[in-house]
Amino acid sequence: ERLPLTPVSLKVSTNSTRQSLHLQWTVHNLPYHQELKMVFQIQISRIETSNVIWVGNYSTTVKWNQVLHWSWESELPLECATHFVRIKSLVDDAKFPEPNFWSNWSSWEEVSVQDSTGQDILFVFPKDKLVEEGTNVTICYVSRNIQNNVSCYLEGKQIHGEQLDPHVTAFNLNSVPFIRNKGTNIYCEASQGNVSEGMKGIVLFVSKVLEEPKDFSCETEDFKTLHCTWDPGTDTALGWSKQPSQSYTLFESFSGEKKLCTHKNWCNWQITQDSQETYNFTLIAENYLRKRSVNILFNLTHRVYLMNPFSVNFENVNATNAIMTWKVHSIRNNFTYLCQIELHGEGKMMQYNVSIKVNGEYFLSELEPATEYMARVRCADASHFWKWSEWSGQNFTTLEAAPSEAPDVWRIVSLEPGNHTVTLFWKPLSKLHANGKILFYNVVVENLDKPSSSELHSIPAPANSTKLILDRCSYQICVIANNSVGASPASVIVISADPENKEVEEERIAGTEGGFSLSWKPQPGDVIGYVVDWCDHTQDVLGDFQWKNVGPNTTSTVISTDAFRPGVRYDFRIYGLSTKRIACLLEKKTGYSQELAPSDNPHVLVDTLTSHSFTLSWKDYSTESQPGFIQGYHVYLKSKARQCHPRFEKAVLSDGSECCKYKIDNPEEKALIVDNLKPESFYEFFITPFTSAGEGPSATFTKVTTPDEHSSM
């Protein structure tokens, strides 16, 4: 009959930080030099032996005289309660056929972690525990005095637990969140009535979950060093040095080498000159709670990230071409580089690709003259494209060329006794056509009636007009723009000896917010185009004179500009240009982009006051300088009479008072006889002009009293 192999010499040690019990024991009566498969059943009780909280089996092969070890982690801190452990065994080996039976239990081993020392009446456990966000944690308090009421608070909010015995209460905290890197605060308060007997607290250090490094990548710029980078994600460091930032280690499996990285998001790896081409890297992130790793496998020649090109220069720069040169850092013999050139200028971008060996060169053509360009270049391995280098760039400016377009020229001709005064205007050439800085304009005046006679006026830039006094002959005027290289084509305009068409009637037009829509009858005969010019009606014509060229087959145009202001009248003239470049005035138009109500009222005089009538006149009132076309006048009259005078009708003023109103529809009718009045009567009048936008401003009424019948004025 077999002896039961009872476990003996059971010893239990504790690890408070890990909240673990470590058991060690031996087995008696084991045959000498024999190995047996055995099962051990372990029972763990809490507070009292009858309160079994865990039972489990542990299977192992046991040798003679062997000390066996087994550990168990408690969810409750060991300081919270006394634990009891016992063990029994069963032989489970083919060498011993059935029946097998369990040994007796070992005696209970009591485990008590005493941290409840001193005079304190309250303790909270565990102290300074480090856990990962989302884990479940059990805490407890131990109260010396069961008469005390103990309340516990997590971050200032009361929590409720389960009483394990009169002195101990445990709290299960489910899925603890990360709150701050200095930990989650928990405190308990012992009180009797409203007297606080003591407070104790712990910090639960909750770490963010360590993330797998993202975007792990390695590359070389010189075949000497591999530069590896990654996104480390959240830093899991905690305060009070409870957990430092996660560490990063590079491990290369082909060479078996390992390197602890000193930076959180990059690491350099020395390439040994043993022609290793393939690398298999594992990046390991590690903190006190876990490890995370990522892997990359690559061929070294496929991971070349070149240093940026250098010595970028421009040679043989002229007005339209340049040769761009650059150098690349040589990293291996017979290496082919693919380079990309970007050319920025005049708001445009061009891109070119070129393959090179050592030094780069590219012919840049079709450039604009006198233009600053920014050219930049980047390169990559042409054989195994990995990524572009950084850009290297430089600015250069092309040389000037002669202006390529004639200036846009127009004129105002005013007739004076015995001569013409011609005011000549031109628009500055656009950058595209100036091809450099315009220095001066040549104005050549040629008398067409005396062909040998011509005059040259040189006008320094940036002037854009000049005044010429010419006699009553026909003249051809040429305007040429000049820069440092040469002259533009000439702009030609002819001034006829005949006076301009004076018979043209001025037509009123209404503008819109978008500007003025103009149309005209085509000029009989051949025309090479039309010109519309305009200016502010009330100002000196030179102030804001503008013009627009219109093609020969067009008889309408829209003049739209932000310069048009409400309440300002603009005068437009439309000219036809003959094949001989003689301008003929076709139409005149005038109007407002937006009419406004009159800005002032007329100054009214009272004439010929009699006992039965008086005359009102405002002859000095100018209808021209108003913010809209004056359409007429409203005459307001107040009197004691109930009825309005003939031609007047009842009206209500803005203040609600009643009066009589008479409307004059002719803006040039600037007088009114008010008759059928009573002698020695009191009258009040007020006259205001009106436009399509409304009346003039409100004003006070003027008082008039008619004399008696026998008086004479």
Partner: antibody
Amino acid sequence: QVHLVQSGAEVKKPGASVKVSCKASGYTFTSYGISWVRQAPGQGLEWMGWLSTYSGNTNYAQKLQGRVTMTTDTSTSTAYMELRSLRSDDTAVYYCARGNFYYYGMDVWGQGTTVTVSS
Amino acid sequence: EIVLTQSPGTLSLSPGERATLSCRASQSVSSSYLAWYQQKPGQAPRLLIFGASSRATGIPDRFSGSGSGTDFTLTISRLEPEDFAVYYCQQYGSSPPITFGQGTRLEIK
């Protein structure tokens, strides 16, 4: 930024009462207790008592029992300390301090309120 | 009630020297519950050390605390001009009262 801001200086006659306020900002008021400490001119620090901001429970130094009351208004994150039957030896600077029960120290202090008791 | 006795009452040293301040308890104090404070004239005290040896936030590493049971020490490894002040030790048990030592004045020699 964590701050404790106390009310201004007071001058009182013997037998009168004084009430000092301490307004907290920059942290969860109910996560920490408040201790009151005083310092007579040229003397050391004397603990007067503490207040549990969550429960309102208090514990007072034996020598002040019956004369001192500590209260809290969690809606305004303000603690108050009232001292009655003032004597000339109550002349001192009165400090409120945040009691941190996680590392058992007073880690944030008010600027102090001078109370002068004089006839 | 636990009585804390600090020594010396006054300590005269020069900048750059090492300062050692002592705090003795009338009965055993858990090291978790001993703190040190610095106070300058006209200012509130400032927490330097908690749990006998842990530096509070923002305290330079020239300040260190040690000790257990009844004997505790505050050491300033290399005095800076701004370190001259009064230093207090304080104990906290979960049973009141909290008590302070009488203070050590650290002055420039």
